[in-house]
């Protein structure tokens, strides 16, 4: 793993509100050179958020993750906390980003060993959570609305940085062996697909309970199925922003070297997700223009439907 200079490549000016530790898989500090200290939290869906290390919930979360890491290591796995340099596992693909966050990938950073190829499900369902698509908008027209944002501050404040791209399309989790993370949880996503015993035509996936404590974060081997983007419905609740890539092949070859700088534009901060079933299939987007948060949603089969008052809105129609 390349540990380059300590130049600050993530700037956090807005910190996230509480996230349950149950849904966190990894944390690390930003670089000392960033000035303002922050903890970068990674969620189970590989979204990154800035958090204030002085907040009690952040301290508790880090302590919990440390214990989990220790337990996993005892079980023969590895789990990285990685204090210091902040790097995506693969690429800072056009995932969500807050207007208060600036991510500057190093031009000489390692390139991803994986190229994202989301399915049509991903395209239609979730600009909100697809690693390859901006988080600023999300599909609508279904019956399941986003949950109410936290009331005390008018909803969670956004700090999402970027997501880690999907790895493969099927998963079978064996019940006998511990689900080991990769050699480095914060390195290239050279994760091997879990051995599948399912006929792909059945569209089935299997999960068995392994032995390690709480299935301690098996994040080195997160496997995405069928171009999944599991939670589009809340992707807007933290004022996430769609990045504006500095090059034109917006979905191709998202290696760190391909993005000289990332800036953001604000978009609507609430939305309702697509709840319509979508046919699975292969879809490899090759956009010819940069992806802006204000892009025409029809191009990707979504409809932007802001919910001005999520507290009052019912979650189902």
């Amino acid at each position: 793993q390349h540990h380059g200079v300590t130049k600050c490549n993530i700037t956090c000016s807005k910190m996230t509100s509480k996230i349950p530790v149950a849904l966190l898989i990894h944390y690390q500090q930003n670089q000392a050179s960033c000035g303002k200290r922050a903890i970068i939290l990674e969620t189970r869906q590989h979204r990154l958020f800035c958090a204030d290390p002085k907040e009690q919930w952040v301290k508790d979360a880090m302590q919990h993750l440390d214990r989990q890491a220790a337990a996993l290591t005892r079980n023969g796995g590895t789990f990285e906390k990685q204090i210091g340099e902040v790097k995506p596992r693969t690429t800072p693909a056009a995932g969500g980003m807050d207007e208060s966050v600036v991510l500057e990938p190093e031009a000489t950073g390692e390139s991803s060993s994986l190229e994202p190829t989301p399915s049509s499900q991903e395209a239609q369902r979730a600009l909100g959570t697809s690693p390859e698509l901006p988080t600023g908008v999300t599909g609508s027209s279904g019956t399941r609305l986003p949950p109410t944002p936290k009331a005390q501050d008018g909803g969670p404040v956004g700090t999402e940085l970027f997501r880690v791209p999907p790895v493969s399309t099927a998963a079978t989790w064996q019940s006998s062996a511990p689900h080991q993370p990769g050699p480095s949880l914060w390195a290239e996503a050279k994760t091997s697909e879990a051995p599948s015993t399912q006929d792909p035509s059945t569209q089935a996936s299997t999960a068995s309970s392994p032995a390690p404590e709480e299935n301690a974060p098996s994040e080195g081997q997160r496997v995405w199925g069928q171009g999944q983007s599991p939670r589009p419905e809340n992707s807007l609740e933290r004022e996430e922003m769609g990045p504006v890539p500095a090059h034109t092949d917006a979905f191709q070859d998202w290696g760190p070297g391909s993005m000289a700088h990332v800036s953001v534009v604000p978009v609507s901060s609430e939305g309702t997700p697509s709840r319509e079933p979508v046919a699975s299939g292969s879809w490899t987007p090759k956009a010819e223009e940069p992806i802006h948060a204000t892009m025409d949603p029809q191009r990707l089969g979504v409809l932007i439907t802001p919910v001005p008052d999520a507290q009052a809105a019912t979650r189902r129609q």
Epitope: T16, S17, K18, I19, P20, V21, A22, L23, T43, Q45, R47, F49, Q56, W57, D60, H64, Q121, R125, A126, G142, R144, P146, P147, K150, A151, Q152, P156, A171, W173, Q203, A204, S205, A207, S208, S209, E214, N215, S218, Q221, R222, V223, W224, G225, Q226, Q228, S229, P230, R231, P232, E233, N234, E237, R238, P273, S274, R275, E276, P277, V278, R315
Partner: antibody
Framework: EVQLVQSGAEVKKPGATVKISCKAS????????IHWVQQAPGKGLEWMGW????????KFNERFKGRVTITADKSTNTAYMELSSLRSEDTAVYYC???????????????WGQGTTLTVSS | DIQMTQSPSSLSASVGDRVTITCRAS??????LAWYQQKPGKAPKLLLY???TLAEGVPSRFSGSGSGTDYTLTISSLQPEDFATYYC?????????FGGGTKLEIK
């Protein structure tokens, strides 16, 4: 309307395996985590594990480790929970439930199946 | 694991009464708490979640309070349909755990 419909009651012998189904409708099946919750007679609720159909590795309650398998058939929007090496204390009602929240909010369970009663008896 | 201790385990009250059920966590759960109502032979029903947010369709007579490790569910004026068993659930950390339940009976 979101609905989770579970399979019917089961009677099994100790040592056997049971497979309970949970058919989802009214939402995009692959977008939401499915959880399984056990409720033994006269007892409280116990979370067994989560899984998102066809995707991330599951997470299980340590108490059920090695005995639970969760599968999902996306063509029929059905999740399955298989419990092996059954013993009498597995006699319970088993619920599937979904958590509607993004990972920034957490897993509370807003939709539940009607429950499947499992009786383990020799 | 975080243990959830609910009290009382049973409670008798009359229609119109104000009742309070408490839930204590063995560690900080940072307000990631949900309350459920369960009637015999039925699945639990979500009442409140994170930061005491009322779930969809739940009457406003139900409210929650608390922080840190101590939380309370209050029913301001009991209605006949409120007689049921109530459970709290923490979802700060896995394994998610529920309280032992409070059975609310008609006096």
């Amino acid at each position: 309307e979101v609905q989770l419909v579970q399979s019917g009651a089961e009677v099994k012998k100790p040592g056997a395996t049971v497979k309970i189904s949970c058919k989802a409708s009214g939402y995009t099946f692959t977008n939401y985590y499915i959880h399984w919750v056990q409720q033994a007679p006269g007892k409280g609720l116990e979370w067994m594990g989560w899984f998102i159909p066809g995707s991330d590795p599951p997470k299980f309650n340590e108490r059920f480790k090695g005995r639970v398998t969760i599968t999902a058939d996306k063509s029929t929007n059905t999740a399955y929970m298989e419990l092996s090496s059954l013993r009498s204390e597995d006699t319970a009602v088993y619920y599937c439930a979904t958590s509607p929240t993004d990972e920034t909010q957490g897993d509370y369970f807003d939709y539940w199946g009607q429950g499947t009663t499992l009786t383990v008896s020799s | 694991d975080i243990q959830m201790t609910q009290s009382p385990s049973s409670l008798s009250a009359s229609v119109g009464d104000r009742v309070t059920i408490t839930c204590r966590a063995s560690g900080r759960i940072h307000d990631f708490l949900a309350w459920y109502q369960q009637k015999p032979g039925k699945a639990p029903k979500l009442l409140l979640y994170t930061d005491n947010t009322l779930a969809e369709g739940v009457p406003s007579r139900f409210s929650g309070s608390g922080s840190g490790t101590d939380y309370t569910l209050t029913i301001s004026s009991l209605q006949p349909e409120d007689f049921a068993t109530y459970y709290c659930q923490q979802f700060w950390s896995t394994p998610y755990t529920f309280g032992g339940g409070t059975k609310l009976e008609i006096k």
